[in-house]
């Protein structure tokens, strides 16, 4: 039987001569040469060789166990003269044995990693971690050590985990952002003799919010015209924030200030500067200087950092409004203003008055803008603002003058304001009333006295404040002898009356009435009308039966009468 | 006078790409975030992204519907913005205009006169 | 995100008169960050109004806007024939958000 299973080869030999392995022996060799040894299997004859005759192998080259541990070979014995096997075909091991051959590799060559600022003592950054080809099972070829070589006293590593913790207290973002930690992995436990291999870990503190904002100076100026519509920007300020992102977000806000109400400010999103904006309209007149407390604050704090103190700061902010060349303004948004139509030309009417706002109080003139008075019925004084008449009234053909008056600065003519002026025309008698219509009426030949043929009205332009009140009467020269009469009905209304029974219009076809009809008002006006009169035929009913012509065909103001 | 004037705009086939450009002048325009926002023929406004000034990083900021697919960029020395759309879809058919927010960088002041983007097959 | 709801989504009015166009948001937002803009057809936005009350430039003053926390308000006084248009609401927050829109139309 064979009297061997595996053999032991060390790796990485360096002799001259072939490394010897270890011998092939069966208990049937006689020592004579008459049996002949075979290996076959991994790497026989080109890696292992044997000597047919004695049995003893050999390694041709040199061997790494990193490389192929284990080798599996087969043996044979036969008899040389027969050709036949002494011994069953055998299987066996050669192990290579390890040595510490190979340093611990890290798996990465550059680790990146973050850690936030400020963080405690211990915090965890990154785990590196590193390996041995050598053989774990053996020795302590494979047992690796982590050390640090470079970045202490900021950071430790773990000997055996390889985790990177922080190592000091405070490290401060703002003071030192990148951090280069060199670490090492030794092998024999980090004995001496010991193999080792390096990495670098890049570590960058990462921002947390332990800095709040600071205004860079603690009073600001800004000038802004009074005309700035609201909504206006009017100056920036920027709080610096050593912090990043967003804990360096700022809010600004307006705490404390006469003009609180009146400005705003908004944070530039990108640029995170404080916007100071006009809120409402300014008035260079009433307030020329405001001063503001303008406060910066983060809005996302963090409460471990409170301690640093009040994470918020303020400056003073002046605002001088400037004065801007305001046109005049007038003492109302409009007038109304009444004259009598009666009034004499050059009659003053009553007086505008329009003053320069601005704090100089430039001297202003006055006009009439001459698109709205184009018949001139009107003039001002351009020093005092007195509208007066330059033209004869009438209420009766004009009730209401619209005009616009112009108020304009004399030392800048730039600057100028209107204002409407609505002047009433008052009522003066000066309209006699007069018939409503053109009146022609008839009676019958047969007419019986005081029969009413006509109803009478008047009209009259004027509009008196108590109403009108009309009085009807014949005419002087007709009022003796008349075959008529006229009763005044005392509600601006006249009746014609027959006088007699009976007409003959053979006789007398027409009858001229000559109507006196006056106002109640003063001066008393007054106007005489003509009625005409003609006679006709009619039937028993009083229906007119035949006229002359000329009375049959006037169009209107016929009147049956009775 | 702040002038925003789109370019690039055409006629592409749905899966297809196209890159729009905006020249902008008569502002600082690296003070300023800019934006892209489209409206498809008959409908509403739809903002499209967003490219924050350097201070910010050049942060980008997407609608859902084009995100993974359109990437907007700025070149700051050319007063440029620019808009990359890959994978173009019939949906992305619409006029595209370049806007600058007002002072602050609130709202959107300022409009080019828009670019006709047309996916169709 | 935000959601900005306007409403009415569609109005007729005639001239002269006064119309009131609201914005509701589905989550608390600063005024600060809430703005109004008049487009016309075939024509780019218009700002109107930032930062929930402050007109921008050249804008009349028959605009006005109002509102804080989720509710805010367009009004515009005595509407005027140029002033026919569809108009939109958007806050600040990333992402951006506009309301639906808001078409004014003649009576």
């Known amino acids: 039987s064979w009297m061997w299973n595996q053999f032991f080869l060390l790796e990485e030999y360096t002799g001259s001569d072939y490394q010897y392995v270890g011998k092939l022996h069966s208990d049937q060799d006689r020592g004579d040469g008459s049996l002949k040894y075979i290996l076959s299997g991994d790497g026989a004859g080109d890696l292992f060789i044997i000597n047919e005759n004695t049995g003893d192998i050999q390694a041709t080259k040199r061997l790494d166990r990193e490389e192929k541990p284990v080798y599996i070979l087969r043996a044979q014995a036969i008899n040389r003269r027969t050709g036949r096997p002494v011994e069953p075909e055998s299987e066996f091991i050669i192990k290579i044995h390890d040595i510490n051959d190979n340093e611990p590799i890290f798996t990465k060559d550059v680790y990146t990693a973050t850690v936030p600022e400020m963080a405690d003592v211990g915090t965890f950054v990154v785990q590196v971690t590193a390996t041995d080809a050598d053989d774990p099972t053996y020795g302590n070829s494979a047992k690796v050590v982590y050390s640090i070589l470079q970045g202490q006293p900021y950071f430790s590593v773990e000997s055996e985990t390889g985790i990177i913790k922080t190592a000091l207290l405070n490290m401060d973002r703002e003071n030192r952002e990148q951090y280069q930690v060199v670490i090492q992995a030794k092998d024999m436990g980090g004995q001496m003799g010991g193999l080792s291999g390096t990495t670098t870990v890049n570590i960058t503190l990462t921002d947390v919010n332990d800095n709040p904002p600071r205004f860079p100076q603690s009073t600001y100026q800004f000038k802004t015209p009074e005309s700035s519509p609201p909504g206006t920007p009017i100056g920036r300020i920027k709080a610096s924030d050593a912090d990043v992102g967003e804990n360096a977000e700022i809010e600004y806000s307006i705490t404390d200030g006469e003009g609180h109400d009146m400005f705003d400010v908004i944070t530039d999103q990108e640029t995170q500067e404080g916007i100071i904006t006009v809120k409402k309209l300014l008035d260079f007149e009433k307030k020329r200087v405001y001063t503001l407390k303008v406060e910066a604050s983060n809005p996302h704090i963090e409460p471990r950092f409170l301690y640093l103190g009040p994470f918020k700061d303020s400056a003073t902010v002046r605002i001088v409004v400037d004065d801007v060349d305001e046109p005049p303004v007038f003492s109302k948004p409009a007038y109304i203003l009444q004259i009598r139509e009666d009034a004499q030309i050059n009659t003053t009417i009553g007086s505008v008055a329009a003053q320069d706002p601005d704090a100089a109080r430039n001297p202003v003139k006055y006009s009439v803008d001459r698109h709205t008075d184009m018949d001139r019925i009107f003039n001002i004084d351009s020093g005092n603002g007195s509208i007066f008449t330059s033209k004869l009234l009438d209420r009766e053909t004009l009730l209401w003058h619209n005009i616009t008056v112009i108020a304009t600065e004399i030392n800048n003519p730039k600057q100028s304001s209107r204002v409407p002026l609505y002047i009433k025309v008052l009522d003066v008698n000066d309209n006699a009333p007069e018939f409503a219509e053109f009146y022609e009426t008839f009676v019958c030949e047969k007419a019986k006295a005081d029969q009413l043929i006509q109803t009478l009205h008047a009209v009259d332009k004027d509009d008196p404040y108590s109403g009108h009140q009309f009085s009807f009467s014949l005419a002087p020269e007709a009022a003796s002898g008349s075959n008529f009469t006229i009763q005044d009905n005392k509600d601006n209304t006249a009746g014609i009356l027959t006088r007699k029974n009976g007409y003959n219009r053979h006789e007398m076809s027409t009858y001229l009435l000559p109507v006196v009809i006056s106002d109640n008002d003063y001066p008393v006006q007054s106007s005489t009308g003509t009625v005409t009169v003609r006679v006709c035929a009619c039937d028993h009913h009083g229906n007119m039966q035949s006229c002359h012509a000329e009375a049959l065909i006037h169009p209107t103001g016929l009147s049956t009468g009775a | 006078e702040v002038q925003l004037v789109e370019s690039g705009g055409g006629l592409v086939q749905p899966g297809g790409s196209l890159r729009l450009s905006c020249a902008a002048s008569g502002f600082t325009f690296t003070t300023y975030a800019m934006n892209w926002v489209r409206q498809a023929p008959g409908k509403g406004l739809e903002w499209v992204a967003r490219i924050r000034i350097k201070n910010n990083n050049y942060a980008t900021y997407y609608a859902d519907s084009v995100t993974d697919r359109f990437t907007i960029s700025r070149d700051d020395s050319k007063n440029s913005l620019y808009l990359q759309m890959n994978s173009l879809k019939t949906e992305d058919t619409a006029v595209y205009y370049c806007?600058?927010?007002?002072?602050?960088?609130?709202?959107?002041?300022?409009w080019g006169q828009g670019t006709l983007v047309t996916v169709s097959s | 995100d935000i959601q900005l709801t306007q409403s009415p989504s569609s109005l007729s009015a005639s001239v002269g008169d006064r119309v009131t166009i609201t914005c509701s948001a589905s989550?608390?937002?600063?005024?600060?960050?809430l703005h109004w803009y008049q487009q016309k057809p075939g024509k780019s936005p218009k700002l109107l109004i930032y930062r929930s009350f402050y007109l921008a430039s050249g804008v009349p003053s028959r605009f006005s806007g109002s509102g804080s926390g989720t509710d805010f308000t367009l009004t515009i006084s005595s509407l005027q024939p140029e002033d026919f248009a569809t108009y939109y609401c958007q806050q600040d927050i990333v992402p951006l958000t506009f309301g639906q829109g808001t078409k004014l139309e003649i009576k």
């Open positions: 989550s608390s937002i600063s005024s600060h960050y």
């Open positions: 806007v600058r927010p007002d002072y602050g960088n609130y709202g959107l002041a300022y």
